[in-house]
């Protein structure tokens, strides 16, 4: 679960230890602030929950790629 350290900065202190299918993910954002202890990815899931994930993990990278492609594909 991400933590807001102030109004502008949200940090992750722990990562999910379980892979989530990309079908359950809606969007993501990267956390790169120097105010945070570690770089992270926050996924927003289909049920609007925010989950912290480790950007070094392959499933996280694959999921970000998939979500990027989804947003690039115009809906017909």
């Amino acid at each position: 679960q991400p933590d807001a350290i102030n109004a502008a900065v949200t940090c992750c202190y722990n990562f999910t230890n379980r892979k989530i299918s990309v079908q359950r993910l809606a969007s993501y954002r990267r956390i790169t602030s120097s105010k945070c202890p570690k770089e992270a990815v926050i996924f927003k899931t289909i049920v609007a929950k925010e989950i912290c994930a480790d950007p070094k993990q392959k499933w996280v990278q694959d999921s970000m790629d998939h979500l990027d492609k989804q947003t690039q594909t115009p809906k017909t």
Partner: antibody
Framework: QVQLVQSGAEVKKPGSSVKVSCKAS????????ISWVRQAPGQGLEWMGG????????NYAQKFQGRVTITADESTSTAYMELSSLRSEDTAVYYC????????????WGQGTLVTVSS | EIVLTQSPATLSLSPGERATLSCRAS???????LAWYQQKPGQAPRLLIY???DRAEGVPARFSGSGSGTDFTLTISSLEPEDFAVYYC??????????FGQGTKVEIK
């Protein structure tokens, strides 16, 4: 500890409807769903459908489409399964089971409700 | 709809023996979203394994799951008297379309 408590056994006439309830306690309701699974005497498990609470819409197995209605009342943490146009083949134990919408395995189950359809 | 086929239908073994149960899917089960349940007579099913190989809380180490794609296995390394039951596999790739296998009964030889 999460607990799912279902309503009691029912005896119904062919052609009628039955509504089974499933009350959840001891856990968060928001990003979880409830599935309904039935088991006819001596048979295997059959998924009927499910509902994710914050979506307020249910999904149904094709076999039950049009005959089953699954609803949830977040204020009372209770899910309901209504099956209409009952026939003798609907005699079964009906289970509710909880799942996390991020995954899907059924981690907690109700005790089951026996529905007998007989004229 | 993904169809799950379990084999064998019945497995007759003695306590202490190893049980190997198979579950084959008609389509690729992405993300290994497959679970195994144990059901004893008159009881609700109990989750044993999720994500193909992760043991649920409180499940003894003699139960293990493996597999990916279309072929999955539940192994009970050494059967205890309380393990004689029916076992079901379940896929949960799509939240709108879960399916179960037809079950494997593990009975005492």
């Amino acid at each position: 500890q999460v607990q799912l408590v279902q309503s009691g056994a029912e005896v119904k006439k062919p052609g009628s409807s039955v509504k089974v309830s499933c009350k959840a306690s001891g856990g968060t309701f928001s990003h979880y769903g409830i599935s309904w699974v039935r088991q006819a005497p001596g048979q295997g498990l059959e998924w009927m459908g499910g509902i994710i609470h914050i979506f307020h819409t249910a999904n149904y197995a094709q076999k039950f489409q049009g005959r089953v209605t699954i609803t949830a009342d977040e204020s009372t943490s209770t899910a309901y399964m209504e099956l209409s146009s009952l026939r003798s083949e609907d005699t079964a134990v009906y289970y509710c089971a909880r799942y996390d919408a991020h995954y899907g395995e059924l981690d907690f189950w109700g005790q089951g409700t026996l529905v007998t359809v007989s004229s | 709809e993904i169809v799950l086929t379990q084999s064998p239908a019945t497995l007759s073994l003695s306590p202490g023996e190893r049980a190997t149960l198979s579950c084959r899917a008609s389509q690729h089960v992405s993300d290994a979203y497959l679970a195994w349940y144990q059901q004893k007579p008159g009881q609700a099913p109990r989750l044993l394994i999720y994500d193909a190989s992760d043991r649920a809380e409180g499940v003894p180490a003699r139960f293990s799951g493996s597999g990916s794609g279309t072929d999955f296995t539940l192994t009970i390394s050494s059967l205890e008297p309380e393990d004689f039951a029916v076992y079901y596999c379940h896929q949960y790739i799509h939240l709108h379309s879960f399916t179960f296998g037809q079950g494997t009964k593990v009975e005492i030889k």
